[in-house]
């Protein structure tokens, strides 16, 4: 048992353009309140109770009037937390609508009208003891800002209030494997019942009537020694029970979705992607249909034509999730390169890009060809961050800008001389040699280690390099 | 050189699942998003979603959701389709493709699968 | 959705014609138009990205051009590995969004 608390901050208009009209008026004073319904995400009644975890009202705000002429402010909100008790265990997982209601005070007949101003909807997980935990929510042109927790009811204990806590039957400290209940440290962990018949020594529980088993041992009732030919295919850490390697459970080992459900791991943990009719956790929850309203955010929902399909919830801009419950990250697309920073504006993607990079996904490396001449037709060559000119014959430096001596680097093999020409270079070869570069013996009886010299090329001529 | 290189045609009966892998090298895997289209025989390419290569989360297109799952195994550089409950409209040919920005500038060769009973 | 349309699905041209394919999108999408050639053996690949960025390793006979909702491929010398289907598609919303393809034989 325990209670979920719901904390507003403000209630008032969005940023960007077209903010919404004042709610009140100094001919029609009002004043605002909330209500908060909530959903297991783990539940098979969450499909037909509407509110299954819970529900509840805010007291009526302040009395507001609006300012002539003034644009709308965030509006004045009623005091205290709007606490939705739970009776079982907190499931974790859970849905929520938060409404923003209107209640006029003019003069009407018959009493204060109400209204609804706005409805924001949310699928989250969340562990019973944890801090509070901050959102923020669009409907439309308002926006809402709100914290929210679980915590757990005494003598209950743990993230989905299950464990137990009881006074201390010892002064000093808890009972065997029993641990001070935080933040009670007065008192202890109550020893839960586990499955009858669970090892006591390979075996544990979590919540009442369940049989966990530890690493090295399984069946029902943790008795069973995991097998050695586990040893064939390591993924774990070594088990002194058995001596060898023992598989680690993956995320995914056994498949933990329910219904037909595909399991994939994550970097943190895994993910179900459920076949159409069921979602949650685990695609646990089943049975839903249109009527029940499980498209958030605006989504559109179409009923499917087969058990398979028994709604399909198509998301309007910026939202994505079976139940169009996740706002589309477009910076998860990865678009930016080189190490940009990505923004996700809403109407736009932004790279802000390192040092040294440009362009709307930083793909141009500001030290790279783009705009970077090679004089004397050199060519420019992109590499790792930098650019060099590969020069035309007859220039070098860094932007091919310098006259180059071709003859500077003595290419003419076997003594032959060179000269240098407007196209290039020219070797004289010695006598016994040709080539371009003089790098062929001619043959002492006068046949060249070539096919043949080219028409009209005596060996032993200057023979042009080009 | 960038490569993505996709597993083999298969041919699977209404109901099976399949799981088609497509396999990167050339790049940082964990750099660009990696991105699924499917094509049915005689028809046009559909965008069907994408997952991030960092995080592991994926993205799906209305028409992906429920039967389709992406997911990665980083240290092989390898990303995965896997298709539940087959139906006889899964008949198409599955490209993977990465994403630089702007556009799907490498794809898969395709891997081809005949759902039939 | 942004609808994409290709209203020439097939196209008939001569050896080292001009070939223009068209694209309208039914939303405005801010350059984020990109062209795909898939060959008849299936392989798909990126020609024009953002609506005339050539990508590495194509040839200069294609370029893109267009803005606003309409867009097209342009192929100034056409060559017999030309023949293909071409498709454009938007990467500006999600979901992104292909046009039916054109198809170009030759005469």
């Known amino acids: 048992a325990g209670v979920f608390e719901l904390q507003i901050h403000s209630f008032g208009p969005g940023p960007g353009p077209g903010a919404p009209r004042s709610p009140c008026s100094a001919r029609l004073p009002c004043r605002l309140f909330f209500r908060v319904c909530l959903k297991p995400g783990l539940s098979e009644e969450a499909a037909e109770s509407p509110c299954a975890l819970g529900a509840a009202l805010s007291a009526r705000g302040p009395v507001y009037t609006e300012q002539p002429g003034a644009p709308a402010p965030d509006l004045p909100l009623p005091d205290g937390l709007l606490q939705v008790p739970f009776r079982d265990a907190w499931p974790g997982t859970f849905s929520f609508i938060i409404e923003t209601w209107r209640e006029e005070l003019g003069d009407q007949i018959g009493g204060p009208a109400w209204s609804l101003l706005a409805r924001v909807a949310g699928r989250r997980r969340l562990a019973a003891g944890g801090p509070w935990a901050r959102d923020i929510q669009r409907a439309g042109a308002w926006e809402l800002r709100f914290s929210y927790r679980a915590r757990c009811e005494p003598p209950a204990v743990g993230t989905a209030c299950t464990r137990l806590c009881r006074p201390r039957s010892a002064p000093s400290r808890c009972g065997p494997g029993l641990r001070p209940c935080a933040p009670l440290e007065d008192e202890c962990e109550a020893p839960l019942v586990c499955r009858a018949g669970c090892s006591p020594e390979h075996g544990f529980c979590e919540q009442p009537g369940e049989c966990r088993c530890l690493e090295g041992w399984t069946g029902p009732l943790c008795t069973v020694p995991v097998s050695t030919s586990s040893c064939l295919s390591p993924r774990g850490p070594s088990s002194a029970t058995t001596g060898c390697l023992v598989p680690g459970p993956g995320p995914c080992d056994g498949n933990p979705c329910a219904n037909g459900g595909s399991c994939s791991e994550t970097p943190r943990s895994f993910e179900c992607t459920c076949p159409r009719g069921f979602y949650g956790l685990r695609c646990e929850v089943s049975g839903v249909t249109c009527a029940d309203g499980p498209c958030f955010n605006g989504g559109l929902c179409v009923g499917g034509a087969d058990p398979d399909s028994a709604y399909i919830c198509h998301c309007p801009p910026g939202f994505q999730g079976s139940n169009c419950e996740k706002r589309v990250d477009r910076c998860s697309l990865q678009p930016c390169r080189n190490g940009g920073l990505c923004l996700d504006l809403g109407h736009a993607l932004r790279c802000r890009c390192r040092a040294g990079f440009a362009g709307p996904r930083c793909e141009h490396d500001l030290d790279d060809c783009a705009g970077r001449a090679c004089a004397n037709g050199g060519t420019c060559v992109e590499g790792g961050g930098a650019h060099r000119c590969s020069c035309a014959l007859g220039f070098g430096g860094r932007d091919c800008r310098e006259r180059a001596d071709p003859c500077a680097a003595r290419p003419c093999a076997h003594g032959g001389r060179c000269y240098a020409h407007f196209s290039g270079l020219v070797c004289a070869c010695a006598p016994g040699y040709m080539g371009a570069r003089c790098e062929f013996p001619v043959h002492p009886d006068g046949a060249s280690a070539l096919p043949a010299a080219p028409p009209g090329l005596r060996p032993g001529d200057p023979q042009r390099y080009l | 050189q960038i490569q993505l290189v996709q597993s083999g045609p298969e041919l699977k009966k209404p109901g099976e699942t399949v799981k088609i892998s497509c396999k990167a090298s050339?790049?940082?895997?964990?750099?660009?998003?990696m991105h699924w289209v499917k094509q049915a025989p005689g028809k046009g390419l559909k965008w069907m979603g994408w997952?991030?290569?960092?995080?592991?989360?994926?993205g799906y297109a209305d028409d992906f959701k429920g039967r389709f799952a992406f997911s990665l195994e980083t240290s092989a550089s390898t990303a995965y389709l896997q298709i539940n409950n087959l139906k006889n409209e899964d008949t198409a040919t599955y490209f993977c493709?990465?994403?630089?920005?702007?556009?799907?500038?490498?794809w898969g060769q395709g891997t081809s699968v005949t759902v039939s009973s | 959705d942004i609808q994409m349309t290709q209203t020439t699905s097939s196209l008939s041209a001569s050896l080292g014609d001009r070939v223009t394919i068209s694209c309208r999108a039914s939303?405005?999408?801010?350059?984020?138009l990109n062209w795909y050639q898939q060959k008849p053996d299936g392989t798909v690949k990126l020609l024009i990205y953002?609506?005339?960025r050539l990508h590495s390793g194509v040839p200069s006979r294609f370029s893109g051009s267009g803005s606003g909702t309409d867009y097209s491929l342009t192929i100034s010398n056409l060559e017999l590995e030309d023949i293909a289907t071409y498709f454009c598609?938007?990467?500006?919303?999600?979901?992104?969004?292909f046009g039916g393809g054109t198809k170009l034989e030759i005469k």
């Open positions: 493709a990465r994403y630089d920005g702007y556009a799907m500038h490498y």
């Open positions: 050339g790049y940082t895997f964990t750099d660009y998003s």
């Open positions: 997952i991030n290569t960092e995080t592991g989360e994926p």
């Open positions: 939303q405005d999408h801010s350059n984020y």
């Open positions: 953002y609506t005339s």
């Open positions: 598609q938007q990467g500006d919303m999600l979901p992104w969004t």
